[in-house]
Amino acid sequence: AGVFELQIHSFGPGPGPGAPRSPCSARLPCRLFFRVCLKPGLSEEAAESPCALGAALSARGPVYTEQPGAPAPDLPLPDGLLQVPFRDAWPGTFSFIIETWREELGDQIGGPAWSLLARVAGRRRLAAGGPWARDIQRAGAWELRFSYRARCEPPAVGTACTRLCRPRSAPSRCGPGLRPCAPLEDECEAPLVCRAGCSPEHGFCEQPGECRCLEGWTGPLCTVPVSTSSCLSPRGPSSATTGCLVPGPGPCDGNPCANGGSCSETPRSFECTCPRGFYGLRCEVSGVTCADGPCFNGGLCVGGADPDSAYICHCPPGFQGSNCEKRVDRCSLQPCRNGGLCLDLGHALRCRCRAGFAGPRCEHDLDDCAGRACANGGTCVEGGGAHRCSCALGFGGRDCRERADPCAARPCAHGGRCYAHFSGLVCACAPGYMGARCEFPVHPDGASALPAA
């Protein structure tokens, strides 16, 4: 038994052009956290397995708010180590997946939203009990720097944590630097000592006196990067500086990228562009599966129907992303038309419409009379910010539903008397006046003062 420990040193924009700005903003502060997944790397089949060696989630880091105009820095990290306990033997060779997650702390309805910023992976050799190994991995334009080690939990010892060694109550009969071990009380175990000068960062040993190199390093003491060993890697003019007359094979010769990955040369080495579902320096690590629990926020995980997708997350309403990690801001899609106010209720949206508009998304302009009926033979008239009904005689109100008193407005002029009639109204004019509304005076000679034609 033992513990795999991961220490994140920095996470931030990588070198070169196209470096991303901070994932946080003044409007949307955020904080980071990390997830590590470990798989035994003894065979290709093992790489397909879930996080069989274990997984761990870090604490949340400090809240970070981007300062406008400032260059994107390394982001503040969570305190402490990520620790993955393992119960059985440490396998020596293992695969890892490290995910960097962002927790947005804006005013999301229903709490914070998570999104996956970067995922790195690789396969490494590592003996338990050895020193910290340092690593740098890039994911897109992001760069992650970290160290890791495996240590045995007492009473386990050894490069695989399979031997048991217990301290003795009696004074030790072992010489200086030696430890008594079970099951034989008188057997003494020497601490593992690698070959003198073996690089503590890039080499390790499983037997005393040896120096085995981590991926990417070579030489008797693991101090020479693979890409610059001897004169085989450099090509072209730079070969002359190494004393080589013939350019050696390039780093992409023979295509070191597994699983259909494509290789491109970099100034110091090579880079694999992996097909979907594969990760790692040489695309040797396969994607996450449902057994890893990759679906956040109650998403339902199902195995993918095609080899390109190891799993599919069916997200609950309000979440999306390949891992259901993103809270859907459906209001950002501006569903509410005509200046309507969008309210995200989580399960549904509601649009609060401005005056003159209606419908689920305020798409209906009340001015246009559509969907509005004027009763009792009235006709709809557009304009003025709201629909208006021109009512038939004898009716009134917004929708012509009210029976009108045609005499209420005193339509008969000059003292004429108004009488309601089924077809409208009739004015009985006072002496000296005439016309439908008694609007014209009658002159003494009998001629009416009608307006000139």
Epitope: P317, R330, L333, P335, R337, L345, H347, A348, L349, R350, C351, A358, G359, P360, R361, E363, H364, A370, G371
Partner: antibody
Amino acid sequence: EVQLVESGGGLVQPGGSQRLSCAASGFTFSSYWMNWVRQAPGKGLEWVANIKEDGSEKYYVDSVKGRFTISRDNAKNSLYLQMNSLRAEDTAVYYCARDPGWAPFDYWGQGTLVTVSS
Amino acid sequence: DIQMSQSPSSLSASVGDRVTITCRASQGISNYLAWFQQKPGKAPKSLIYAASSLQSGVPSKFSGSGSGTDFTLAISSLQPEDFATYYCQQYNSFPYTFGQGTTLEIK
């Protein structure tokens, strides 16, 4: 689990009436606009009508205005379509569908067939 | 009313293929467009809303694009269950209208 179950379909004579119902479960019915959509045999989809959460707004396609009435009973989690003066061209499978706000139809019922024929 | 026209009206493809279906609106509808899948004898199923947003639970093999009057639905790596009829629908204004449908058949 969101479920919408239509009922009330059947054979009806031209000029006759029919009332369709849609029973909703698995969600807060009173928080959603609801729709009726129909599909004539072998044809495409046609939106028929919708109604606001509280029933205060209703909209119809021109071809059914004055003949069809959409209504709801939030206490019973039910949506209705009263169809009068039916015509042969109203023959279709009628679906009820939920409107979550970001787009009109996220969940649909299985449909009920109305056949208008003499 | 806004008319929606889809092309092609039918399409034959093989398992594993990638296909695209186009939809054109008779006037600009911004991004107020949805896509639906319907299998014979079944109710339609919502795939995409707001022209390009995936409905919850829909696999990412489906993608939508476009704005204004021209829109596209793409389906990658076709599987047997993807052979169905696909409809576009505008919800820019009442009445909501659908395209006539595109039937995707197995070759």
